[in-house]
Amino acid sequence: AGVFELQIHSFGPGPGPGAPRSPCSARLPCRLFFRVCLKPGLSEEAAESPCALGAALSARGPVYTEQPGAPAPDLPLPDGLLQVPFRDAWPGTFSFIIETWREELGDQIGGPAWSLLARVAGRRRLAAGGPWARDIQRAGAWELRFSYRARCEPPAVGTACTRLCRPRSAPSRCGPGLRPCAPLEDECEAPLVCRAGCSPEHGFCEQPGECRCLEGWTGPLCTVPVSTSSCLSPRGPSSATTGCLVPGPGPCDGNPCANGGSCSETPRSFECTCPRGFYGLRCEVSGVTCADGPCFNGGLCVGGADPDSAYICHCPPGFQGSNCEKRVDRCSLQPCRNGGLCLDLGHALRCRCRAGFAGPRCEHDLDDCAGRACANGGTCVEGGGAHRCSCALGFGGRDCRERADPCAARPCAHGGRCYAHFSGLVCACAPGYMGARCEFPVHPDGASALPAAPPGLRPGDPQRYL
């Protein structure tokens, strides 16, 4: 066991042209924070894949407000280290992702808005217990400078934090076959005792009492070979004994056994092995007391001292049913975003995303505008998984290719006549009305209702609307 430590030194514009705009403004002050994600090995995994070695979030940095006209400086950073504890051995080679996040502190509805400013990733070799390693990474126009190290937590030592050290029992020397623990010369290496019976050829341990298998072996003591040849038959042996995947439908698919019964296939059909207190072909019959342990998923049994008196299961959060055998419908909270469909699989929630969205909760809006062009000076607007063009004046249609008729909406009031014009539209007002859209009546004495007609225009003149 040990800790990976990350120290951010600076985050700011990188060298070269094209300095990034400051992420904060006087109108929207903000502050930075960082997230680190670690994965073992030299994996080229996507950012969304699990951080198997661990992850950490920094504190928020000081609030920063841009000074108008000043170039974006190095931004104020959070105090302290980012620490990622690891429970098992340090793998020696690892992949990292460091994300710089901006928290806007304006008065948004629902609290601060977060946005990802930069993400850097890399693959490194690093021995635990070594000195700080320095690094510089660039993401677009931003540059991140940082240092990192891995250190073991006592009593673990070594480059992988797998050797254990204990204080010496005798002042002069360590026991037979045990070396002094460098750099703690006053301590001795402790023997690592694996789980009893763990195969010495095919198993190993990094923590006392465990048994981890080398590739090609499985089972609690690593004594069972993972066979591939026996998997070739249409329904080969079960995965528990061989490590094979069992394809194809079978009578136990969907588990027909109720009340936590386990299903095993027979030559003709299936057989249920029922838990205590249940019987019947599908374990559907109960003559149960609390002594039989009828409550599943950690439910608490109350009453039911004898088979004739009823028992009640008080279910833990997330479960319900007379035996706590049913999961609560977690999808009713609608965790999927952007119209995604929620599926409660029991062990996890899944979201089936609509076109244009991705991510575990459909939170990523795919770039609808990528490769799409809006004609005649229109700009592409993302949203809802389908691109939309915001067209320049005088153009319309899906891609702004059609000339818009500015008179189509009948913009001239009080019977005024509309004329299309290269810069917009012109209204020729009916007698008694004036204004850009003929919206103002002219009083009989020649005075107009507010606002007054611009100088040089008589009430009957066409008004150009720009």
């Epitope: 699990p50 951080c51 992850a55 979030l57 959060p317 977690r330 609608q334 965790p335 929630l349 909760r361």
Partner: nanobody, 120 residues
Framework: EVQLVESGGGEVQPGGSLRLSCAAS????????MGWYRQAPGKQRELVAG???????KYAESVKGRFTISRDNAKNTVYLQMSSLRAEDTAVYYC??????????????WGQGTLVTVKP
Amino acid sequence: EVQLVESGGGEVQPGGSLRLSCAASGSIFSINAMGWYRQAPGKQRELVAGFTGDGSTKYAESVKGRFTISRDNAKNTVYLQMSSLRAEDTAVYYCAADVQLLTSDYEFYWGQGTLVTVKP
């Protein structure tokens, strides 16, 4: 690991009010959806009110106009203000949250529940 800690339950007379709080703590990157479920004896657990993944609020028909859900993002806390309470609101109220962890994974968590009893 993430913990949800509820408070504010108790006994109240019909027509009375209570305010429940639920604070989330632990390895949280962000809270995607969070709300309150309740379970009355012998009944299925049902959603009472919640903030969905899209940030909108959702209420059970039976509590609309009487219960209000609110949140404090800075404290990772949601509140349920319950007014005009009725006998049929008696239940164990559970806080629930769909959380994005520091590892980027999403997990669904439950609180231990707080008992609300409405009786004359």
